[in-house]
Structure formats: structure tokens, C-alpha cells
């Protein structure tokens, strides 16, 4: 739902977006996902920040916690206990890195309408969550995990190694937790809550990377985070599981790494629970093209656990990096030994398949010329799947629905029909046992949120329409977005063109490139979206292209591996190749053309400005990775191997942005950063600076005291006021 | 109030049998391990089964091992001990006791008296 | 099996006195899961301290446990009329839980 295009004759009403109303929000969406309890139940906070639980089948609604309460204690989250006894309240929210943050944590008794007194929670906790059944806690303070067997009994200490940059136990170091769960937590309650199963990261030999934080003290404090760059030592992973019944019986037992892994340095990428008694563990070679899913089970004459060679899964690239972003998870079915999983087919599509025994003996589920892209729920007779299949458009999404309880298996698509126009990129949320679910979609039209019936797929109700922005929008001129296909070369170019509103293909328009462009990414999607560049091409006039080239996702892996030990190589090249093919269109003024990226896309807008191709007259490269050897070791080293001579060093070296700081000399080039940059480090910034100033060539820069990778709150409007302003002046457009 | 109160305990001769019972109120019973400890007369304590708040594991200590069974009902809120082939050693008072994480003991009933005699 | 050994067998002080109780264990109890208990004629015992050093609800701020390893100590701090009883030390750490022997604690 495009807010409909009004004739010219009401023009005049209509106005432009601006720069202000993308600052404030004014045109930012809600989305709706239940917070499933049951099969039929969810809560919800409501508007006057009620918890109020829902009941599908009944009808009716009440409030489990009041306002009152949770203002009582400032709290901003909430969690409720399976049996329903207790809600811990979150407050004191103290954001750490991209997931993780401490907080304090209030446990309020909804029998007697009172917080538990006793034994409190210490302060600050780093993670806290409920068991799957009754009212047990875990929580991690101080890098130690503590069990609770109640809210208000005394803490059972289960680990005690734990020190800040050191030993992290249920919870992830920072590149775990950035590049390889990606989570705040690492510790999973078995379905019953009888086990307890943690990784413990050991960080005592990574080197740390240190930079200032200023603060407004008299001197500026140090970071310091244990981060193993490209090549350097890596943290060392254990996982254990306790029994949370009697944890001190025989305390913490080690799961074992299966021996191909353990030959060399490896890494733990997921842990999925099959039963009480049976996990699920999925291990990578640091070369990260091999990895073994390992099924154990638990021995009760030894209280151990046996993880037999025979249950063991090998999966394997031949032409890249292991899975897609990440390795695929397995979803287990109902008899707890064969599940379904998304890897390459024969052809170098991901696909869902399905194991029973062996890997090699894996029943293929779906297939075609597109990609599966994430398995929501199996159930007895149905499995819930998501891909990009429906009229060959990879940037959209789907839900389908397979039989399984049928043969053959029928698919039907649950949602390709049901609002065309408006919705063609879905997500999904299932109650247990998918008896309910809740769509939410996220364009291209205004994004909607609705409860089906997960029998018929009929649909229940409206959760979220966005009427008040949809009112919003009917005076403004929104620009016209488009998404086509380039061929060229055997390669599919997809782009996103957000076009002016009165666009006119005889005209000449500036062109701006926005790029992103790192392995496994997608920039062109059919979403909504009201941001810097809708008022970009609304008030001002541009066109704005975002180009999926190669080492982008979800259209088969020749695509996708092509970039595999050679970033910063074609990711440009099809940048550059799109935008030549969009200068033969004929409205591109070619001597007004830019491009603009964050983090990977600040790296290729970056090498793309010097390239030396006389494309661009200007760019901007925000918080930018500038040579591999700075960056992560984790995300590098999957698409790079190791920085080392006898593997992939010469790349690296001829990969970097310093290297072409000559080219430099003819654009006009932007360079920004945020000095308290976590993830990708101010280091990156820095040299490329130094570089530029080496080679004599002019550039502006703009730095963020203290702030990190997403230069956020007042910095987000300096950012892109300062951006507009660039880019007006390379445009020559008048302020 | 926690309440933990112990009975069946008696006289008994050795190589007999008895069934002890413990009943608990003021807390959620299913939420919890359980254990009995022994304490001979005069002497020190001595741990000698536990259980899972579900009761799906139970554990022994190697004297009782083969002889005592340890069971428990949620839905009565009753925690028992069953006692076959009892010795003269068996002789002291049997104490209930809310067991911590398979850790400490805390609170305990006031304990039942088995004598192991002929 | 761990064995304590707890020391001394019987301790006489005064109301007033500070009281240290010793446990030593015959092998390292591990991540300090000592627990102490005090048990009065004719009634059960009675939790005081768990994990070597936590009090556990209700006990006055007298008594306080220290130690890890193979040495674990009980304190308290000002002896009162009602502390005069026997205590236990009991470790978790290691699978048959055992108890200490006792110390009696009694008015000079």
C-alpha cells in the first residue's frame, strides 16, 4: 500500500519530504510480533505500556502487569516465567556492544502482587533468562553463570573462572558475539529445564585491541577489548552442561569436540536441544569451509556425554565458505534423530533438505533456481519455510508451507497472494505447535502485521496497519522506487532505482550510489522505507541506485562465492559496471555521479572512488574497513582465509584502500568515523587518512568523539546534515 | 512457613522393612530436590538419598545402595523413603531435609526415629 | 570420598568472644561448595552458611564463612547466649556429599 499517486491538479498540496522529517522519525513504521505463552496465547504491551496477555480462541484479553508496576521500577522490558508465577522486570538498560548489554533485574510475584524480597538479584546482571518449564533462573554476572531454583532462593553458583576480558561463561566474547551466534547469550536450557548447557570463551591469549574514550573527565579513559583481528590467536571455546536438578552432583561436564575438528583451531557456531537428554552441536574448522554437526547424548551410568562418530554430520564447501552468512541451524523433527537443514544443492542453490542418517543420503525438499531462506517451524504434518521464489524476484519473501505428513510433499505459498501490491517481503511468527501465527510484512507498500489461523492459514485479524502513517503520507510526494535486472556477462545485476517524484526519463539527474555490497548481503529488497535517501531523491532531485553484484545473497552460490578470497575486487566492478549501464539509460547526468556506503559499503564506495575510472566525482566512506588485516577474524578469515603467506597474504596487501591513495587525487572524497568504534576501529579511519596525507591528496574528514559504529543520537542528524551538505556541493545543488 | 514433618519411623528388627514419610507445606514442592540425612545417636550426619524435583533421578549414598528406594508423589506433596533389609547401622534419626541444587540442606524436619534392633 | 575434619572437638569461650570453627578437607573442595550448619539439642540442624561465604536468609551478620581449597573457617564475631550449640561444615563439591565430624561450642 504506496499511498496512492495523486493527479497533477492536486500537486500543489502535496509537499516534499525533508531532511527534518527523516531526523525525526516522522515516517518510521510499527511492526507487531506477538510474544507467544502458549498455543493460542501472547502478550503484548500496549500502548499505555500495560503487559496485557491475549487469548486467540476465547477472545479475551487482561492485564498481567500494570503500568504502575513496571513504572515503579523504570522498567523498559519484561519476561514472564513458563508456569506463569513470576515476571522479572528489566531496568537500568546499559547497552555493551551490537547485542549485549547489563541491566538490573526486579522479580515481581504475580500470586501476591508483590516483588520478590530476599535473596535479589545482584547488579549488574550481563544476561538473565527463565527456564522452559516453571520459574528456574539463570543469570550471568561478573562473567559467571548462577542458578536459581526459584526467584526468591539463594543462588547456586555454577561456574566460578569467570573475569572481565578473560573467561566469559554464558555469554559470548565480543567476535563470537558479533560474527558467530550472533547473540548476547551463550547458554540454552534443555526443553525441560532438567540441563543446562554453556560455552565458556576463553580470551587469555587474544591480543586487545585499545582506544581512547573521552568522556568529559580531565583524562580519557582506555577500552579495552580482547578482539582477535585477521590471522591473530583466537578465543578458545569449551562447552559444558550441568544438570540443574542436582548441579552439584557431578558439577559441569564437558561435551566433546568431535576429532576432525579438534585437529586444529576450530570454532562452536550453535547449539540446538533435541530432547532433555539429547543435544545438538554444530563445530567449524577456523578455515571455515568444513563443518561437523554433532548429535550427543546424554549416559546416565556416567553422567557424561556421548557425542558418537556416527552422529556426526560433515558438511563441506567446495567452492566457498561453509553455509551462507552463517551456518544453517537444523530444525529437528518429531522423532529426535533426523531433522531438516539449508544447504547448497548439486546446482549451488541453498536449499532445504532433509537428514535421517547421513549427509550423502540427504532427501532434497525444495528446489529451483532460487534460495530457501529460513526454516520457521516444523510440525507433525507441516514445515514452515520462507524463500525467494515467487516470480523469480530474489529481493522478496515468501512463506510457504510443505506437507510432510503427505507423500509426495505439497507446497503451497501462504502469503504470495494475500496483499500483492503491498506486501512481498514477510517474516513469520508461530505459537507453539504453529497453531496460530503472526505475518508480518514489510513492504513494499506500508508494512502490516496479521494473525492467521495456523490450520487454514485463514486470516484473524489485524494486529498492525500503520494507519497513522498512512495518513501521514497522503500530502507527501514520495519518490518512485523500481526493481529491475541488469545482464551482463552471465552475471544478474539487480538494482533498486528510487526515482525523483516528477521523474522525467528525458531529463538529467544526479546519481547517487548507495552500496553496502559484503558477502551474503542483499541491498535490494522489496521493503518500505522513508529514509535519508527518499528525501534525497524527493527533495532534491537525485537518483538513487542500490546494485546487488556479485558475493551478494540468495541467488545460488556462483553468485555469492565468486568474491571468496578476493574481496574489494568484483563487488567494485559491478558498482561500476551498473552504474556505466545506467549512464546508457539516458537520464543520468554522468558528470554528477557519487556513491556513498557504510562499514563494507564505506571499503567499496571507497575502492570504487579510486578505481581510477573517472566515474565518480565524489563519494563518502563511512566507518570503513580499509585493509583486511584490521578486521575480525571470524568474518575475515570466512571469506578471506588467513593473512599469512603461504595462504592469502598477497590479497590482503592488494586489497587494502591505502594502497590506491593516489587515485584519490581527481574526487572529492568524505571520510568519516566514530572514534569509539568497537567493530570496525577508528585504526581503519586513521590509516587512510595517514595514506591520503602521505600522497599529497585533499580530502574532508569528519570524526565522532566516542561514538561506535552506528554513530547514533545526536550524531545521526550531524551525520546526515553533513552528508547532504557534501553531497548538494559535489551536485552543485543550492541549499 | 517451610514445614517439613517426618513419620514412620518405629522399632523394627534387622533384615525387616519400613517406610518413611515426609509431608511438605509453605513451598512449591515440585519445584524442588529432596534428600534424607541420618544422624546416629550421638554422632555425626550422614547424607543418604536424594531426589529430583521431578523424580526422574534419584541418588544414594553407597551404605544404602540396593536397600533403600527414595520416591516421591508432587501431587501429595510427599517425599518417602522405603527401607528393606534395614541393619543395626541403619539406627538413627531420619531427617527430610529441601535440598539445594543437589548442594545444602535447608529447611530440615524435625527428624523420625528408626531403631534397628532385636 | 572427601573426609572433613573439623577443629576443635569442643570450643569453650564466653558471651562475647569471637569463635573461629576450622574444617580442613582431606582433598580440595571445589568452587568452595562448603556449606555450615549449627544444630541444637533435640532439633534439627540449621543452615547458616553455603557456598564457603553466603549467608543464608535469616542469619545474623555474626557469623561469616571464609576459606577455599582444603581450609574453610566459621566465624562469629560476638558470641551470644543462643550460639552455644554444634556445628557442621558439609562440602557438595565432590560426590558423596559429606559432613564434618562437628565442633561443640560451649560456655566457659
Known amino acids: 500500500l504506496r499511498p496512492s499517486r495523486v493527479h497533477n491538479s492536486e500537486e500543489n498540496t502535496m509537499r516534499a519530504l525533508t531532511l527534518k522529517d527523516i531526523l525525526n522519525g516522522t515516517f518510521s513504521y510499527k511492526t507487531f510480533f506477538p510474544n507467544w505463552i502458549s498455543g493460542q496465547e501472547y502478550l503484548h504491551q500496549s500502548a499505555d505500556n500495560n503487559i496485557v496477555l491475549y487469548n486467540i480462541e476465547t477472545g479475551q484479553s487482561y492485564t498481567i502487569l500494570s503500568n504502575r508496576t513496571m513504572k515503579s521500577v523504570n522498567a523498559s522490558n519484561y519476561g514472564l516465567s513458563p508456569d506463569r508465577q513470576f515476571v522479572y522486570l528489566e531496568s537500568d538498560y546499559s547497552k555493551l556492544w551490537r547485542y549485549s548489554y547489563t541491566a538490573t533485574y526486579y522479580i515481581y510475584d504475580l500470586s501476591n502482587g508483590e516483588f520478590v524480597r530476599g535473596n535479589e538479584l545482584p547488579r549488574p546482571i550481563q544476561y538473565l533468562c527463565w527456564s522452559p518449564v516453571g520459574s528456574k533462573l539463570a543469570y550471568v554476572y561478573q562473567n559467571n553463570i548462577y542458578l536459581k531454583q526459584r526467584p526468591g532462593d539463594p543462588p547456586f553458583q555454577i561456574t566460578f573462572n569467570g573475569r572481565e576480558n578473560k573467561i566469559f561463561n554464558g555469554i559470548p566474547d565480543w567476535v563470537y558475539e558479533e560474527e558467530m551466534l550472533p547473540t548476547k547469550y551463550a547458554l540454552w536450557w534443555s526443553p525441560n529445564g532438567k540441563f543446562l548447557a554453556y560455552a565458556e570463551f576463553n580470551d587469555k591469549d587474544i591480543p586487545v585491541i585499545a582506544y581512547s574514550y573521552y568522556g568529559d573527565e580531565q583524562y580519557p579513559r582506555t577500552i579495552n577489548i580482547p578482539y582477535p583481528k585477521a590471522g591473530a590467536k583466537n578465543p578458545v571455546v569449551r562447552i559444558f552442561i550441568i544438570d540443574t536438578t542436582y548441579p552439584a552432583y557431578v558439577g559441569p561436564q564437558e561435551v566433546p569436540v568431535p576429532a576432525m575438528i579438534a585437529s586444529s583451531d576450530y570454532y562452536f557456531s550453535w547449539l540446538t536441544w533435541v530432547t532433555d537428554e539429547r543435544v545438538c552441536l554444530q563445530w567449524l574448522k577456523r578455515v571455515q569451509n568444513v563443518s561437523v554437526l554433532s548429535i550427543c547424548d546424554f549416559r546416565e551410568d556416567w553422567q557424561t556425554w556421548d557425542c558418537p562418530k556416527t552422529q556426526e554430520h560433515i558438511e563441506e564447501s567446495r567452492t566457498g565458505w561453509a553455509g551462507g552468512f552463517f551456518v544453517s541451524r537444523p530444525v529437528f523433527s518429531y522423532d529426535a534423530i533426523s531433522y531438516y537443514k539449508i544447504f547448497s544443492d548439486k546446482d549451488g542453490y541453498k536449499h532445504i533438505h532433509y537428514i535421517k542418517d547421513t549427509v550423502e543420503n540427504a532427501i532434497q525438499i525444495t528446489s529451483g533456481k532460487w534460495e530457501a531462506i529460513n526454516i520457521f517451524r516444523v510440525t507433525q504434518d507441516s514445515l514452515f519455510y520462507s524463500s525467494n521464489e515467487f516470480e523469480e524476484y530474489p529481493g522478496r519473501r515468501n512463506i510457504y508451507r510443505i506437507s510432510i505428513g503427505s507423500y509426495p510433499p505439497s507446497k503451497k505459498c501462504v502469503t504470495c497472494h494475500l496483499r500483492k501490491e503491498r506486501c512481498q517481503y514477510y517474516t513469520a511468527s508461530f505459537s507453539d505447535y504453529a497453531k496460530y501465527y503472526a505475518l508480518v510484512c514489510y513492504g513494499p507498500g506500508i508494512p502490516i502485521s496479521t494473525l492467521h489461523d495456523g490450520r487454514t492459514d485463514q486470516e484473524i485479524k489485524i494486529l498492525e496497519e500503520n494507519k497513522e502513517l498512512e495518513n501521514a503520507l497522503k500530502n507527501i510526494q514520495l519518490p518512485k522506487e523500481e526493481i529491475k535486472k541488469l545482464e551482463v556477462d552471465e552475471i544478474t545485476l539487480w538494482y533498486k532505482m528510487i526515482l525523483p517524484p516528477q521523474f522525467d526519463r528525458s531529463k538529467k539527474y544526479p546519481l547517487l550510489i548507495q552500496v553496502y555490497g559484503g558477502p551474503c548481503s542483499q541491498s535490494v529488497r522489496s521493503v518500505f522505507a522513508v529514509n535519508w535517501i527518499s528525501y534525497l531523491a524527493s527533495k532534491e532531485g537525485m537518483v538513487i541506485a542500490l546494485v546487488d553484484g556479485r558475493g551478494t545473497a540468495f541467488q545460488g552460490d556462483k553468485l555469492l562465492y565468486a568474491v571468496y578470497r578476493k574481496l574489494g575486487v568484483y563487488e567494485v566492478e559491478d558498482q561500476i559496471t551498473a552504474v556505466r549501464k545506467f549512464i546508457e539509460m539516458g537520464f543520468i547526468d554522468e558528470k554528477r555521479i557519487a556513491i556513498w556506503g557504510w562499514s563494507y559499503g564505506g571499503y567499496v564506495s571507497s575502492l570504487a572512488l579510486a578505481s581510477g575510472t573517472g566515474l565518480f566525482k565524489c563519494g563518502i566512506a563511512v566507518a570503513p574497513v580499509s585493509s583486511w588485516e584490521y578486521y575480525a577474524s571470524v568474518y575475515t578469515e570466512r571469506f578471506m582465509g588467513l593473512p599469512t603467506k603461504d595462504d592469502n597474504l598477497e590479497h590482503y596487501k592488494n586489497s587494502t584502500v591505502m594502497a590506491r591513495a593516489e587515485y584519490f587525487r581527481n574526487v572529492d572524497y568524505l571520510l568519516i568515523h566514530g572514534t569509539a568504534d568497537d567493530n570496525v576501529h577508528f585504526q581503519n579511519s586513521a590509516q587512510i587518512a595517514k595514506a591520503l596525507v602521505n600522497a599529497q591528496v585533499d580530502f574532508q574528514a569528519m570524526w565522532y568523539s566516542d561514538q561506535n559504529h552506528g554513530l547514533s543520537g545526536l550524531s545521526t542528524n550531524h551525520l546526515y546534515t553533513h552528508m547532504t551538505h557534501f553531497l548538494k556541493q559535489c551536485f552543485s545543488l543550492s541549499d | 512457613e517451610v514445614q517439613l514433618l517426618e513419620s514412620g519411623g518405629g522399632l523394627v528388627q534387622p533384615g525387616g522393612s519400613l517406610r518413611l514419610s515426609c509431608a511438605a507445606s509453605?513451598?512449591?514442592?515440585?519445584?524442588?530436590?529432596m534428600s534424607w540425612v541420618r544422624q546416629a545417636p550421638g554422632k555425626g550426619l550422614e547424607w543418604v538419598s536424594g531426589?529430583?524435583?521431578?523424580?526422574?533421578?534419584?541418588y544414594y549414598a553407597d551404605s544404602v545402595k540396593g536397600r533403600f528406594t527414595i520416591s516421591r508423589d508432587n501431587s501429595k506433596n510427599t517425599l518417602y523413603l522405603q527401607m528393606n533389609s534395614l541393619r543395626a547401622e541403619d539406627t538413627a534419626v531420619y531427617y527430610c531435609?529441601?535440598?539445594?541444587?543437589?548442594?545444602?540442606?535447608?529447611?530440615w524436619g524435625r527428624g523420625t526415629l528408626v531403631t534397628v534392633s532385636s | 570420598e572427601i573426609v572433613l575434619t573439623q577443629s576443635p572437638g569442643t570450643l569453650s569461650l564466653s558471651p562475647g568472644e569471637r569463635a573461629t570453627l576450622s574444617c580442613r578437607a582431606s582433598?580440595?573442595?571445589?568452587?568452595?561448595?562448603l556449606a555450615w550448619y549449627q544444630q541444637k539439642p533435640g532439633q534439627a540442624p540449621r543452615l547458616l552458611i553455603y557456598?564457603?561465604?553466603s549467608r543464608a536468609t535469616g542469619i545474623p551478620d555474626r557469623f561469616s564463612g571464609s576459606g577455599s581449597g582444603t581450609d574453610f573457617t566459621l566465624t562469629i564475631s560476638r558470641l551470644e547466649p543462643e550460639d552455644f550449640a554444634v556445628y557442621y561444615c558439609?562440602?557438595?563439591?565432590?560426590?558423596?556429599?559429606?559432613f564434618g565430624q562437628g565442633t561443640r561450642l560451649e560456655i566457659k
Open positions: 557456598g564457603a561465604s
Open positions: 509453605g513451598f512449591t514442592f515440585s519445584s524442588y530436590a
Open positions: 531426589i529430583s524435583e521431578g523424580g526422574g533421578s534419584t
Open positions: 582433598q580440595s573442595v571445589s568452587s568452595s561448595y
Open positions: 531435609a529441601k535440598d539445594y541444587y543437589g548442594g545444602w540442606f535447608d529447611p
Open positions: 558439609q562440602q557438595y563439591g565432590s560426590s558423596p556429599r559429606t
